[in-house]
Amino acid sequence: SIPWNLERITPPRYRADEYQPPDGGSLVEVYLLDTSIQSDHREIEGRVMVTDFENVPEEDGTRFHRQASKCDSHGTHLAGVVSGRDAGVAKGASMRSLRVLNCQGKGTVSGTLIGLEFIRKSQLVQPVGPLVVLLPLAGGYSRVLNAACQRLARAGVVLVTAAGNFRDDACLYSPASAPEVITVGATNAQDQPVTLGTLGTNFGRCVDLFAPGEDIIGASSDCSTCFVSQSGTSQAAAHVAGIAAMMLSAEPELTLAELRQRLIHFSAKDVINEAWFPEDQRVLTPNLVAALPPSTHGAGWQLFCRTVWSAHSGPTRMATAIARCAPDEELLSCSSFSRSGKRRGERMEAQGGKLVCRAHNAFGGEGVYAIARCCLLPQANCSVHTAPPAEASMGTRVHCHQQGHVLTGCSSHWEVEDLGTHKPPVLRPRGQPNQCVGHREASIHASCCHAPGLECKVKEHGIPAPQEQVTVACEEGWTLTGCSALPGTSHVLGAYAVDNTCVVRSRDVSTTGSTSEEAVTAVAICCRSRHLAQASQELQ
Amino acid sequence: EAPEHGTTATFHRCAKDPWRLPGTYVVVLKEETHLSQSERTARRLQAQAARRGYLTKILHVFHGLLPGFLVKMSGDLLELALKLPHVDYIEEDSSVFAQ
């Protein structure tokens, strides 16, 4: 029978044994930085090359007994999960192992850095096909380890890491907190976050997605044909490394940004029970469980977007938060969110030649998040058009006036502490899709993009208050690029995109005592690329 | 040569105390620093430390990903090391664990 985890990552309508061919991932090399491994285990023999790299600290304790099978346990299991002949994800992927963890599973930041440097030098000396680096380890937040991961990622290497097993915010750990790394949390057979003793999988905005990580059957170093079940975010990361190898083998030219977007796009959505996460982390944690794409052929015709949350701004009056897209992604819209509702909106601004999304805290606010919508839009030319506060009763509006530019997102930002709920609601005049409309005391920012074949439309869903949440989704074939609230008044906590749905959250009116019957409207901008669709059809 | 004006090198260490490994430090140099400059900076640190009666050991010189070096030394020398030319920041080594 097929292990639950391989069944889970197989797309619907396929059988795992049919879907995972013996040569899957064969064009890809996966580097594993872990313990020593038993490379002649039947699951992985001939698939794993043990490099001569070793940089580990001495084991703790005077009575430590170095038993080979224990020393090899973690790494052997993970190598089996990635490429094992029976229980592996990418059965055709070849692997190279570096020993950076000792027999107790402990290593150092410096040893890991030297290991990453070794990989980079190997890549320069003998360039091969796509490289995936699996880092099934975690330490405290490390600026230098994150920086090294960033450099390696910018050299075209895909890094996949464990989110950590501390039932904590993954942003407090490295390399999990490195934005360029694909950070993986763990779920179980019931699609619940994995509990590990008193702890469990990490969570939060630094996690990219989850993958099976409990009771995972894989190679055991106890004997050359033994199997064992292990659990942890390492096992989850190994699944994603295997899926990445499969995807890169099918499309070797994929960039890191394209691969990450595909991993997110093909994941199972909204299956994780978020109640397991601390309340303040639920909105930040992606509800995604990794899966293989339904076809080994590319999905190049899709317009892929993902949501990137900033770190929390902190509570000071002038505090801001910045969310950034990856280097080869376009920022198509920017929104903000505050649990207290005290915020001064958000704006898109240039920083180092690239657009970023900045959210502003308000006096008495507990802090804000900036939320960027980051998309893959080849040959795009995007700019931000701003209208200052109109002060007129009809509100502030701005549109994309350049020929061929379409509206992909709207933001609003205000200097006053409270826009007030008594102002008349501002509704968008119909038939003007290329226009952002906002409160008269707010500056309005429109993201306007020109890209071959790009077309966008505005979708709205308004319901009278009191209503804690209003949503509007883009239909099949369209991708959500922009998500904002109308009007941007103070009882609106903010707006953010979850997959292809725009979510607008408002304060619970029963607690605020407000009697305003003001309607809250969720405004989604949905786009698609005819150009990408045509290019894909021509290839097929 | 002194560090460039207005760019003070910073010191970082693990927020989780039991995971800290004091006595080993990663000295990260500014982005465009060449290997020869990294080696020179490491030697300079050793020389200045020796003049103060401290023994240091260069464990590794980084190049390829980040310019810098790994050094075994007393924490007393951090102030001195932060003032070296080309230094961007220094991070105390720390533990990582299988997950």
């Epitope: 044994d17 013996p22 038993q38 490379s39 002649d40 039947r42 023999e45 001939g46 794993v48 090359m49 043990v50 080979a68 099978s69 002949r85 004997c223 050359s224 044909t225 | -």
Partner: antibody, heavy 115, light 107 residues
Amino acid sequence: QVQLVQSGAEVKKPGASVKVSCKASGYTLNNYGISWVRQAPGQGLEWMGWVSFYNGNTNYAQKLQGRGTMTTDPSTSTAYMELRSLRSDDTAVYYCARGYVMDIWGQGTTVTVSS
Amino acid sequence: DIQMTQSPSSLSASVGDRVTITCRASQSINNWLDWYQQKPGKAPKLLIYAASTRPSGVPSRFSGSGSGTDFTLTISSLQPEDFATYYCQQDQDIPPTFGQGTKVEIK
């Protein structure tokens, strides 16, 4: 290139022991164990067991019933298969092969058990 | 142990013929089936692994197919050097077990 070179033919009396060697070269030893397979005259192939160069672990076919011992000496890149209490039906060509996949084979060692 | 049954046990064919040998497992072995070629006085040589994958250096006239319990080795156009005995071997379980062999002779 990758190759396995076995020791020469042996003639043994019933009850005696034989030790066949297999020297591996051209690949990283630790990445593969060595399988031993035998073929009686005019018969098919029979897997006898597997031994690790990495840690000396073994995996024997039940039929050997404790009569066989497989070992490795990584320092000389050599694997050994010893068969004790030889019987006439142990007369066969003994092959070593790389790993469980058995993708590379030695040239074979003929062991004749005869009184 | 898993039993492997090959058919036919021998066959006569001419150069250029298309030859098919079948192998049946006593239980499902997924795609874990290998084919070997053995010439008199020589060691077996791996021809096909994982039911259908050809190692580098094996001519493309050799192909394998099947999954579960039924497998086939096909030689699309028999060459003089292909006259030999062919063995199938299951690689699903330990111990690996071989078929009894199919001898391909010159007609």
